[in-house]
């Protein structure tokens, strides 16, 4: 005759408030004759959770039909879980006896704990923009989870980061916990289109982690490079000078032309283009009138980018005799 085993496969069962918990219990033998009862806790003060034959247990239902002959599944479902339901649940076999039934064997127990999902991670970047080669900090926060064990990872464009510090609070027992992590990220010039991702894995998420993202475009400032060039061809009595502002981000930019130190108010032609890496190029054309009296014209292209100190590039205009005499309307 096979010895009776009480099998409770789950050591830990995480449940959410308001949901239904299923507690599994199977037996390996029909003998000895007697009922299987469910208790929470051990000892004389243990709480009766379910007795098929008597008592009132409106929140409990059986998974299978206990009245069927040869039934060996004594699993139960408990509805509308509340924090008061946490504890260790035991299915216990009794042997019929007189005057009382006698406890014969208990299952190893299943601990029911309240599981709460973490909130969607929120990633916050630095308050001010920083230039490439510098380090910026990003914080990630998620709240309201239980149990305390949680895993947090950082990624930049899919590559895992290692320079971060994480804290889970509180350190002691609590109904729910919070996680806060700070990652240090070195900015690259091409990071305008980059993302940092904070990924949170928790037992309640069943292998489907939560992610929070931040765009490095919010944190980076790529300062422009300036180049001022004079077009070789003259248009009538005008020379075309070009100021090329390259590889800057964000788009916020003010450009002014100065002629021999005097700011020019007149309209200039310009174009803005976006590069593949998300930075911008700005090209501005300035037409300078040429006269015999103006041999030493110095042009300055001044750029103020994203509220930073202005940078400028100068060009001393070269007006050859040949250029002065030329009168054809050639296009630059």
């Amino acid at each position: 005759e096979e010895e009776l085993q009480m099998i409770q496969p789950e050591k830990l069962l995480l449940v959410t408030v308001g949901k239904t918990a299923t507690l599994h219990c199977t037996v390996t033998s029909l003998l000895p004759v007697g009922p299987v009862l469910w208790f929470r806790g051990v000892g004389p003060g243990r709480e009766l959770i379910y007795n098929q034959k008597e008592g009132h247990f409106p929140r409990v239902t059986t998974v299978s039909d206990l009245t069927k002959r040869n039934n060996m599944d004594f699993s139960i479902r408990i509805s509308s879980i509340t924090p008061a339901d946490v504890g260790t649940y035991y299915c216990v076999k009794f042997r019929k006896g007189s005057p009382e039934n006698v406890e014969f064997k208990s299952g190893p127990g299943t601990e029911m704990a309240l599981g709460a999902k973490p909130s969607a991670p929120v990633v916050l970047g630095p308050a001010a923009r920083t230039t490439p080669e510098h380090t910026v900090s990003f914080t990630c926060e998620s709240h309201g989870f239980s149990p305390r064990d949680i895993t947090l990872k950082w990624f930049k464009n899919g590559n895992e980061l290692s320079d971060f510090q994480t804290n889970v609070d509180p350190t002691g027992q609590s109904v729910a916990y919070s996680i806060r992590s700070t990652a240090r990220v070195v900015l690259d010039p091409w990071d305008v289109r980059s993302q940092v991702i904070c990924e949170v894995a928790h037992v309640t998420l069943q292998g489907d982690p939560l992610r929070g993202t931040a765009n490095l475009s919010e944190a980076i400032r790529v300062p422009p490079t300036l180049e001022v060039t004079q077009q070789p061809m003259r248009v009538g009595n005008q020379v075309n000078v070009t100021c090329q502002v390259r590889k800057f981000y964000p788009q916020s930019l003010q450009l002014t032309w100065s002629e021999n130190g005097n700011v020019c108010q007149r309209e200039t032609a310009s174009t803005l283009t976006e590069n593949k890496d998300g930075t911008y190029n700005w090209t501005s054309w300035f037409l300078v009138n040429i006269s015999d009296q103006r041999d030493d014209v110095v042009l300055t292209c001044q750029v103020k980018h994203d509220g930073q100190l202005a940078v400028s590039k100068r060009l001393a205009l070269e007006v050859t005799v040949h250029q002065k005499d030329q009168s054809s309307d050639a296009t630059p």
Epitope: P44, Q52, K53
Partner: antibody, heavy 113, light 108 residues
Framework: EVQLVQSGAEVKKPGATVKISCKAS????????MHWVQQAPGKGLEWIGR????????KYAPKFQGRVTITADTSTNTAYMELSSLRSEDTAVYYC??????WGQGTLVTVSS | EIVLTQSPATLSLSPGERATLSCSAS???????LYWYQQKPGQAPKLWIY???NLASGIPARFSGSGSGTDYTLTISSLEPEDFAVYYC?????????FGQGTKLEIK
Amino acid sequence: EVQLVQSGAEVKKPGATVKISCKASGFNIKDYYMHWVQQAPGKGLEWIGRIDPEDAETKYAPKFQGRVTITADTSTNTAYMELSSLRSEDTAVYYCDRGLAYWGQGTLVTVSS
Amino acid sequence: EIVLTQSPATLSLSPGERATLSCSASSSVSSSYLYWYQQKPGQAPKLWIYSTSNLASGIPARFSGSGSGTDYTLTISSLEPEDFAVYYCHQWSSYPYTFGQGTKLEIK
């Protein structure tokens, strides 16, 4: 819907035997213990005993042991309580109940010479 | 056997008042096995509170139950006219199962 319908009132002479029935509907009596409770006029409730209709196992209160027999017929979904050697103090309303939660309407047994 | 003693035997109160009914056991009863029933004249008892503190279906929230070991209490926070009845505590922790003698809650 769970319902327990008991047999009608009985008048018995001292020394006689009475058998009360409790017909269940809305559930199978095999799945529950069926209890019997006595309530003498103006008095409180007293547990008489119970049966497990699945295997006919019974438990009785010492006060009624030897005079009471609880039986069940699973084919008709009915529980019975038989009390013998009746005396005047057995005059009471007798209730059947399913697993302590659902009660029958009661059966008045009057023992009088 | 476990003897359950209810006190007081009769409690005379007015609607709106708070009622406290006690049930004392001669030996310890697990709270899972302590039930309360309400009975009105000419009616069968009705399960009122199960496992010491859980209200049966449809029982108003003004009722509450508490206790452990040998001392149990049924409390009605503010009496309504329909609450006047007899209340019995009941243990089914060990055979023979027993009831208290009842507390009659009557209108003052």
